[in-house]
């Protein structure tokens, strides 16, 4: 039944049917108003001294504009024992980066160093298995750098960049621990999150994802902000660098799923994911020809004798996809976010190890510059053919 | 529809050779490892080999390893099993499996085929 | 190769028993552990993967628990079509081994 004529949205909201939302109905919210039922607004919040509320599109926000004005802040010097502090724009309006055996929210906590010296991969079935393109769960372990590399997306060592006292791989334990809760120590898997939920109306919203509408009900970071839909009048706070994963999907496929492809990453990354378009607006969506034609490439550039039948049966395995995040949305819900892709890499690498992937990803890499010949990809100014195969294989 | 579907099993001499070919449909070929299991006749079931069509990389059991070996070809989605040298104890029906983790061994086996026998017998 | 044996090698049963099989690793295979289902003249069908997650499409009679070295799986109220042999199998580490198997037949 239509339930629109009960007018179920407040405060001016405009009442649309869906038939797939379990309420049978959608609210489309005037500015200043959120909610299911567009019945949040700043009026029922209230914020401390310092800070001002302001709505977004998440609903209503308590940020302090100016950290020095907040209570809580630094200025109560609540990091001890050395610790560092940094002040934050949303409650608690700091954070404290830990010196060595100290860690907690304000580096209450000793940890005493731990002795034990670096575990090493010994077993002769590992060194064997080892970067032979199979995740081998015998030796998933950080000792042997994850099967070679073989379950983390071809990446060693996620952690490599991760300096807290704690191993935080081997925190990954569904409970927070504070000092694996930076970018470097990818966010304690985020484990830290107080409000960690799942969408609610989960089937709709990946229908609805990255639609150009704005569907309030998705407008979470659960939801992955409804694929910045509701954010379309807010400026991109781009990451620095591009994320390069080869998929096993073909271009066409990949294209076709990519909204929920793009939405499976964001959920993982807790921010949101776009396909980087080259200089003449093309999507850098290019064919993986996998690493045995790599080899076949290399045998081409030494000989030049390669029969042209030959190189055109090579099969599109996958492809290979530039991506950029933009943390507009991350970035006013949130402390987690990515400053730049290499973090946001490790991320995925390490939902690989932990087997949470969704998708047949095959390597991921992190290029904090322009990616090589990327500015070209695509725009019909290719010497020859090798030059265009570089873009594949680079 | 997840489909494999096993052919080339028969009669063949010991010392003989036979290739058994699994043909797969409905899902990306590539992004699954696969492995052949068998059955000797009332008796249970033993892994033989596994392949990651995407990376080409194998594994055998002890049992078969330099008279079996196993290959994929993308472009068919197929895999295959080569058995050269073959002995009386490889009599067994043959089943092809698919792995439900991408590129982890370290998964189920979801989708098997029917199965093809061979039998080795003078 | 790790060694799995599983118990009873043959069971006899009613319709609406409770039944139980048990799997031993002989070593820790963490939860890397499936159940399979197989009827004469059958493919085998995968039942219980990492220990305790039941496949798409088992009925929920069918529940498997354990980790390490020991598994259980257990089919809460025996229907006809349970009737059949259920292998265990490790994959945590190649060569992937079953176990012998378990028939369940009709009392």
């Known amino acids: 039944a239509d339930v629109c004529p009960q007018k179920p949205c407040l405060n001016g909201g405009t009442c649309a049917v869906a038939s797939n939302m379990p309420d049978g109905f959608i609210c489309r919210c005037p500015p200043g108003f959120s909610g299911a039922r567009c019945q949040s607004s700043c009026g029922q919040v209230k914020c401390r001294r310092g800070e001002q509320c302001i709505h977004t599109d998440s609903g209503p926000r308590c940020f302090c504009l100016n950290p020095k004005d907040c209570e809580s802040g630094c200025a109560s010097n609540p990091c001890q024992h050395g610790g560092t502090c940094y002040p934050q724009r949303q409650p608690p309006h700091y954070s404290c980066r830990c010196p060595p055996s100290f860690g907690g929210s304000h580096c209450e906590l000793y940890t005493a160093p731990t002795s034990t010296p670096p575990a090493t991969c010994q077993s002769q079935y590992c060194a064997d298995k080892a970067r032979d393109g199979i995740c081998d769960e015998a030796c998933n372990s950080h000792a042997c750098q994850w099967d070679g590399g073989d379950c983390s997306l071809t990446m060693e060592d996620p952690w490599a960049n991760c300096t807290s006292t704690l191993r935080c791989w081997e925190y990954i334990n569904n409970q927070c621990d504070e000092q694996c809760n930076t970018a470097e120590c990818l966010f304690d898997n985020f484990e830290c999150q107080r409000n960690s939920k799942t969408c609610k109306y989960d089937k709709y919203c990946a229908d609805h994802f990255k639609d150009n509408h704005c569907d309030q009900g998705c407008n979470s970071e659960e939801c992955g902000w409804d694929g910045l839909d509701c954010a379309s009048d807010q400026p991109e706070n781009l990451a620095e660098g591009t994320l390069i994963i080869v998929v096993l999907l073909p271009p066409e496929q990949l294209l076709q799923d990519s909204r929920s492809f793009l939405r499976a990453l964001g959920t993982l990354l807790h921010t949101n994911l776009r396909i980087k378009q080259d200089s003449q607006g093309a999507l850098m969506v290019y064919p993986y020809f996998g690493e045995k034609s790599a080899a076949m490439k290399k045998q081409k550039m030494t000989r030049r004798s390669l029969p042209e039948e030959q190189e055109q049966e090579q099969e599109v395995i996958g492809s290979k996809i530039f991506l950029e995040i933009d943390n507009r949305q991350c970035v006013q819900d949130s402390d987690q976010c990515f400053k730049n892709t290499d973090a946001a890499a490790a991320l995925l690498a390490s939902h690989a190890i932990q087997g949470t992937l969704s998708y047949p990803l095959v390597s991921v890499f992190s290029e904090l510059e322009s990616p090589r010949n990327a500015r070209r990809a695509g725009s019909g100014d290719y010497k020859d053919d090798d030059d265009k195969e570089n873009l594949y294989f680079q | 529809e997840v489909q494999l579907v096993e052919s080339g099993g028969g009669l063949v001499q010991p010392g003989g050779s036979l290739r058994l070919s699994c043909a797969a449909s409905g899902y990306t070929f590539s992004s699954y490892g696969m492995s052949w299991v068998r059955q000797a006749p009332g008796k249970g079931l033993e892994w033989v080999s596994y392949i990651y069509p995407y990376s080409g990389a194998t594994y055998y059991a002890d049992s078969v390893k330099g008279r079996f070996t196993i290959s994929a070809d993308t472009s068919k989605n197929t895999a295959y099993l080569q058995m050269n040298s073959l002995r009386a104890e490889d009599t067994a029906v043959y089943y092809c499996?698919?792995?439900?983790?991408?590129?982890?061994?370290?998964?189920?086996?979801?989708?098997w085929g029917q199965g093809t026998l061979v039998t080795v017998s003078a | 190769d790790i060694q799995m044996t599983q118990s009873p090698s043959s069971l006899s049963a009613s319709v609406g028993d409770r039944v139980t099989i048990t799997c031993r690793a002989s070593q820790n295979i963490k939860r890397f552990l499936a159940w399979y289902q197989q009827k004469p003249g059958k493919a085998p069908k995968l039942l219980i993967y990492g220990a305790s997650t039941r496949e798409s499409g088992v009925p929920s009679r069918f529940s498997g628990s354990g980790s390490g070295t020991d598994f259980t799986l257990t089919i809460s109220s025996l229907q006809p079509e349970d009737f059949a042999t259920y292998y265990c199998?490790?994959?945590?580490?190649?060569?992937?081994?079953f176990g012998q198997g378990t028939k369940v037949e009709i009392k």
């Open positions: 199998q490790q994959y945590y580490r190649s060569p992937h081994t």
């Open positions: 499996a698919r792995h439900s983790g991408y590129y982890r061994i370290s998964s189920a086996m979801d989708v």
